[in-house]
């Protein structure tokens, strides 16, 4: 794995008010230690699928099986937890889907669906047909175990019917659930038979039981909530970027590096150079020059634009991203062709990223 000596001092000056590079909340898959987990890459028309974990290329091994659009992890351990991505490489573009894996005592997870269809859950009965409470939509109650990233909104539903119309109340860990039991309280939408908690925190973990009752009977259903705490992580670079490119002498070219980072990233574009006729320093490490970095004079550090290129511009260009936690590094090659040759974007050459890590 490459290391290098920098020609320039890379200590950065205080920056302009930085841009936020925020990962949108990915779907969370939960497995208990020792269990197997199977995830399907939710991307369409994928010619080739590559997988990464925490930004590092994921290959098959004795516990990880990659078959088509499926990732299987056998005998999961807590070390399998992390941010995963599958990238579908197509002939004209590529797309990446991110998801989290949390290996914990909770067994299942997923996002709760929106109440787009809640009205049909409120069932009116013929007034003569007295009836004890019953569930009207058990499909919406199948997922008992919910693993949700901290700060997300959680919704538990218990669609029911009965005559007279039953009432609904909620328990937490078997005891009456009061508004003062959590900061910000909670909402109960009786019309949709739902309990809603916004901005969940670790203290919200536990068992939530809906009790639905009328004078003819009582039914209940329990959900388990696990709040998955996010922790700071190293930058993650989108697989396949920057992409290899070619252009003719005098042409222009652009390299793009897509960065995902919770913490403020410092982006550098680096190229191998020669110093005193040598490509390597006395320590045996290659000389590298910082062409651009995020900071006061950089308009968009994720893009490196080269104009009026010469043959000397050919070579490897490295996008190196660092935050206070760690680093990530990927590179692409620029081919400079003589003027008579037609240039072409080498989109198909998106091999596994070359990580410094």
């Amino acid at each position: 794995r490459p290391s290098f000596s920098l020609v320039e001092d890379t200590t950065l000056e205080p920056e302009e008010p930085p841009t936020k590079y925020q990962i949108s909340q990915p779907e969370v898959y939960v497995a208990a230690p020792g269990e197997s987990l199977e995830v399907r890459c939710l991307l369409k028309d994928a010619a080739v699928i590559s997988w990464t974990k925490d930004g590092v290329h994921l290959g098959p091994n004795n516990r990880t099986v990659l078959i088509g659009e499926y990732l299987q992890i056998k005998g999961a351990t807590p070390r399998d937890s992390g941010l995963y991505a599958c990238t579908a490489s197509r002939t004209v573009d590529s797309e990446t889907w991110y998801f989290m894996v949390n290996v914990t005592d909770a067994i299942s997870s997923g996002d709760d669906e929106d109440d787009t269809d809640g009205a049909e859950d409120f069932v009116s009965e013929n007034s003569n047909n007295k009836r004890a409470p019953y569930w009207t939509n058990t499909e919406k109650m199948e997922k008992r175990l919910h693993a949700v990233p901290a700060a997300n909104t959680v919704k538990f539903r218990c669609p029911a019917g009965g005559n007279p119309m039953p009432t609904m109340r909620w328990l937490k860990n078997g005891k009456e659930f009061k508004q003062e039991h959590r900061i910000g309280g909670y909402k109960v939408r009786n019309q949709h038979w739902s309990l809603i908690m916004e901005s969940v925190v670790p203290s919200d973990k536990g068992n939530y039981t809906c009790v639905v009752e009328n004078e003819y009977g009582s039914i209940n259903h329990t959900y388990h909530l696990d709040v998955v705490e996010r922790s700071p992580h190293r930058p993650i670079l989108q697989a396949g970027l920057p992409a290899n490119a070619s252009t003719v002498v005098g042409g222009d070219v652009e390299f793009v590096c897509k960065v995902y980072s919770d913490a403020q990233p410092h982006i550098q574009w680096i190229k191998h150079v020669e110093k005193n006729g040598s490509k390597y320093g006395p320590d045996g490490l290659p000389y590298l020059k910082v062409l651009k970095h995020s900071g006061i004079n950089s308009s968009n550090a994720e893009v490196l634009a080269l104009f009026n290129v010469t043959e000397a511009d050919a070579g490897e260009y490295i996008c190196k991203v660092s935050n206070y936690i760690g680093q990530a590094n990927q590179s692409a090659w620029l081919t400079v062709l003589p003027k008579q040759q037609a240039p072409g974007r080498e989109k198909e050459i998106t091999a596994s990223p070359d990580y410094l890590e």
């Epitope: 008010p17 922790s231 935050n323």
Partner: antibody, heavy 113, light 106 residues
Framework: EVQLVQSGAEVKKPGASVKVSCKAS????????MHWVRQAPGQGLEWMGA????????NYNQKFKGRVTLTRDTSISTAYMELSRLRSDDTAVYYC??????WGQGTTVTVSS | AIQLTQSPSSLSASVGDRVTITCSAS?????MSWYQQKPGKAPKLLIY???NLASGVPSRFSGSGSGTDFTLTISSLQPEDFATYYC?????????FGQGTKLEIK
Amino acid sequence: EVQLVQSGAEVKKPGASVKVSCKASGYTFTNYWMHWVRQAPGQGLEWMGAIYPENRDINYNQKFKGRVTLTRDTSISTAYMELSRLRSDDTAVYYCTSRGDYWGQGTTVTVSS
Amino acid sequence: AIQLTQSPSSLSASVGDRVTITCSASSGLSYMSWYQQKPGKAPKLLIYDTSNLASGVPSRFSGSGSGTDFTLTISSLQPEDFATYYCQQWSSYPYTFGQGTKLEIK
């Protein structure tokens, strides 16, 4: 369990150098910056610099550049901070920290003639 | 270097009180971290990336803010919360801390 274990307290004379070690365990040492922070008696926290063990990238606080040297030995998952030309106002507790949430127990360095 | 100024520098409060500590930056930042430190101990991360609660930290701690003004709030003080609190920016070199806010029992 993640642990950062630092070397023991040191007493040095002005002008001397001190080298503090920080041994990491429980996580992949090479994948995370190792930061060094110091705290003078009764004072606040001051960031000195950081080293990225995988490739030896280093960022220094300019205040200490020329006096502080950060190194690492990946074979034993240990980072080192050496401070030279010690002065009495370098008397402080020196911490190593990684990810912001892992901290060593601190190493007290006393500079006194 | 970006300077971080905390206010107040010291604060007396009682168990059960709601306490707010502010941190003002000399330049705009995207994120702020907050630490708690007790005498003779290493700092403990409370909040990272402005509002994310660190693992194992009670939910009575919360963080907010953007740009140059950031806040740490303790919704209901507990006896173990009496300590010194520091803000820190990890956005721009050199990384810097606030001067600290000492929270004492009234």
